[in-house]
């Protein structure tokens, strides 16, 4: 008689990434009997929640439940009903909520309390909502990309199953860019990690890893822009800010109260003789780059070497996966190809920033103006951060791989977070067993 397949024995997990600019829900799936194998967990769904990040709900916490509804209902549809009660749900909030907590623990707690109450109303196994540390965000991003790239597998293969695979067990570094923070995480080459706060030790699948990580709070692309505006308005002669990071002909009115709302601009805060100012774009890459560099204090370093702001950074080592906004911005600018050199990227940015705003709007008619207007700044910021902040060079640029997905799963911290919380990354290498007998009868 012919073998008949039994119902799939699978498990699911849900992670919500509550970022500074938006929330995304990810659904993961894996074969129940292969929990400890490397590379078996994969993403089956991503649902982007409509609206801003949860930290923006301080004045309207009663709207949080509605905000989360669509994506939680989507999860209800995707995951079989029989699995609902055993599907764990985790929410991790990142730098946007770290900044809110810095301003007020009470307000951050209130937002998280309402989020928890809303998520508890669903039939899943809700495991809690918390603000993850910058160190966790960096570490889990590193775990995610190396798990998906098969770097933790001890089996060497004669063929490549994933892009970027160099068929060795050298891990990739992780470069993550969000709206409010950016993380750099990698295994340095035989280098002492001089700052204990930046050192992580892992034992994964029987191998030890000494990992460097740092999260730069306020250096995500949105908060970096607020910082730059706050810095530049200090020296403006009136309420017009001629800004090289915006296209020629672009105009936007900014409220000073909005500018000083974030702790990120605290060092630039001053009493201004006006309540509003107008940004007028002049579209000059070189001047924009120079303005951005002023956000990085490189004059002080208490270690053998630093990134910026006195933060230790070991010499860069190996290949890096650059994901989240590193990828989204570079993808929009059509600069993610492995063949595009750093010099070429700079040239393209010069041309892009110099294009008149009216022309840009026509060329990208389908893109929201708020986002469209900021690509010149964001692209320039990415170059400045990678080259001057992290000390990549024209030569080492080829070691940066702009990654959106690996094997269908988004690069980011959420998968690593779930793998850790569900204990699916063993410290020791699991004993290899013959083919499982549970699949067919």
């Amino acid at each position: 008689t012919q073998n008949k397949a039994l119902p799939e024995n699978v498990k699911y997990g849900i992670v919500l990434d509550a970022g500074s600019s938006h929330t995304s829900l990810y659904i993961y799936k894996w074969p129940a009997e292969k929990e400890n194998d490397t590379g078996v967990v994969h993403q089956v769904e991503e649902c982007r929640v409509k609206g801003p990040g949860i930290s923006k709900f301080v004045q309207k916490v009663n709207e949080i439940g509605i905000y989360l509804t669509d994506c939680m209902e989507r999860a209800r549809e995707v995951i079989p009903r029989s699995q609902h009660q055993e599907t764990p749900v985790y929410l991790g909030a990142t730098a946007g909520m770290r900044l809110l907590r810095m301003e007020s623990e009470e307000l951050a707690d209130r937002v998280l309390d309402v989020v928890e109450r809303s998520l508890s109303n669903y039939p899943f196994d809700f495991q809690g909502a918390r603000i993850i540390t910058g160190q966790e965000e960096g570490a889990y991003g590193w775990i995610t990309i190396n798990y998906l790239l098969g770097k933790f597998s001890q089996k060497t293969r004669w063929f490549s199953i994933v892009p970027y695979e160099t068929n060795n067990q050298e891990t990739f570094g992780a470069l993550d860019l969000g709206g409010a923070s950016t993380q750099v995480t990698f295994v340095p080459q035989n280098q002492t990690i001089e700052s204990p706060d930046n050192a992580l030790q892992f034992r994964l699948y029987g191998k030890d890893y000494n990992v460097y990580t740092h999260s730069f709070l306020c250096y995500g692309k949105d908060q970096a822009l607020w910082q730059k505006l706050a810095k530049d308005i200090q020296v403006a002669s009136n309420e017009i800010l001629r800004d090289p990071c915006f296209h020629p002909g672009y105009k936007k009115v900014v409220n000073v109260s909005d500018l000083y709302k974030t702790p990120c601009t605290k060092r630039f805060e001053m009493t201004l003789p006006f309540q509003q100012f107008e940004i007028q774009g002049i579209g000059n890459y070189q001047q924009c780059h120079q303005s951005i560099l002023e956000l990085f204090n490189t004059s002080y370093c208490p270690y053998s070497q630093c990134a910026f702001n006195g933060i230790f950074l070991p010499p860069l080592q190996g290949d890096f996966g650059a994901f989240s906004a590193f990828y989204f911005v570079m993808k929009f600018l059509n600069l993610t190809s492995e063949k595009v050199s750093q010099e070429k990227v700079t040239e393209m940015m010069k041309k892009f920033c110099a294009q008149p705003w009216e022309e840009i709007k026509t060329s990208y008619a389908g893109v929201k103006e708020k986002y469209l207007s900021e690509y010149c700044f964001s692209g320039t910021y990415i170059l400045s951060l990678l080259l001057q902040g992290y000390h990549f060079t024209a030569d080492s640029w080829e070691h940066i791989h702009f990654i959106g997905k690996i094997q269908g799963s988004d690069a980011g911290w959420t998968l690593g977070y779930m793998l850790n919380l569900t204990n699916m990354i063993p410290a020791e290498q699991p004993l290899s067993t013959p083919l499982s007998h549970s699949t067919y009868v």
């Epitope: 301080v58 004045q59 770290r98 810095m102 007020s104 623990e105 605290k266």
Partner: antibody, heavy 115, light 111 residues
């Protein structure tokens, strides 16, 4: 666990300056503001100001403006409060406290005597 | 500045009895649905210890006999059953507005 350890007692002459340190451990130093509060003998607690260790931005009680400076050394996870032009009424115990709006963790206090 | 007025200045209560301390703010200390009101306990030679935050939430490791209530301008700290180790000075504080301000303190003793 979160700990804030302050420098030792100081005796100063009127007109001099004093600099008190507060070393933090058990958390990410740049994730929380650091406040300074003082308490003169038999008096109520008095908030002096705070610093955002992340970038060195600070806010002060107007009463102390111009006399108080708050700084940080992030590599040493340490905050400093310097009070200048000391007078006898500045004799007090000076505390650092971690928080945004909730002062959940306090240093042990530093007695500054001006005489 | 928001002025915080505590009453009474001192309080003598028998062991096991209830102690009630009041704090009035010169203007509302509520914002975004949160009361930025805190209660601290201070024993001689020690820093203040956070008892209550957000008007009614217990601080970490604080015994259940301590509770807080109120909103807007009027707040109360209650010790449901006074213990010997509760002898201390109690302060209220607001952090709604800079400068953050404290009450004058209430000294709690055993009768």
């Amino acid at each position: 666990q979160v700990q804030l350890v302050q420098s030792g007692a100081e005796v100063k002459k009127p007109g001099a300056s004093v600099k008190v340190s507060c070393k933090a451990s058990g958390y990410t130093f740049t994730d929380y503001n650091m406040h300074w509060v003082r308490q003169a003998p038999g008096q109520r607690l008095e908030w002096m100001g705070y610093i955002v260790p992340l970038n060195g931005g600070s806010t002060f009680n107007q009463k102390f403006k111009g006399r108080v400076t708050i700084t940080v050394d992030t590599s040493a996870s340490t905050a400093y409060m310097e009070l200048s032009s000391l007078r006898s009424e500045d004799t007090a115990v000076y505390y650092c406290a971690r928080g945004g709006t909730r002062f959940a963790y306090w240093g042990q206090g530093t007695l500054v005597t001006v005489s | 500045d928001i002025v915080m007025t505590q009453s009474p200045d001192s309080l003598a209560v028998s062991l096991g009895e209830r102690a009630t301390i009041n704090c009035r703010a010169s203007e509302s200390v509520d914002n975004f649905g949160v009361s930025f009101m805190y209660w601290f306990q201070q024993k001689p030679g020690q820093p203040p210890k956070l008892l209550i935050y957000g008007a009614s939430n217990q601080g970490s490791g604080v015994p259940d006999r301590f509770s807080g209530s109120g909103s807007g301008t009027d707040f109360t700290l209650t010790i449901s059953s006074l213990q010997a180790e509760d002898v201390a000075v109690y302060y209220c504080q607001q952090t709604k507005e800079v400068p953050y301000t404290f009450g004058g303190g209430t000294k709690v003793e055993i009768k």
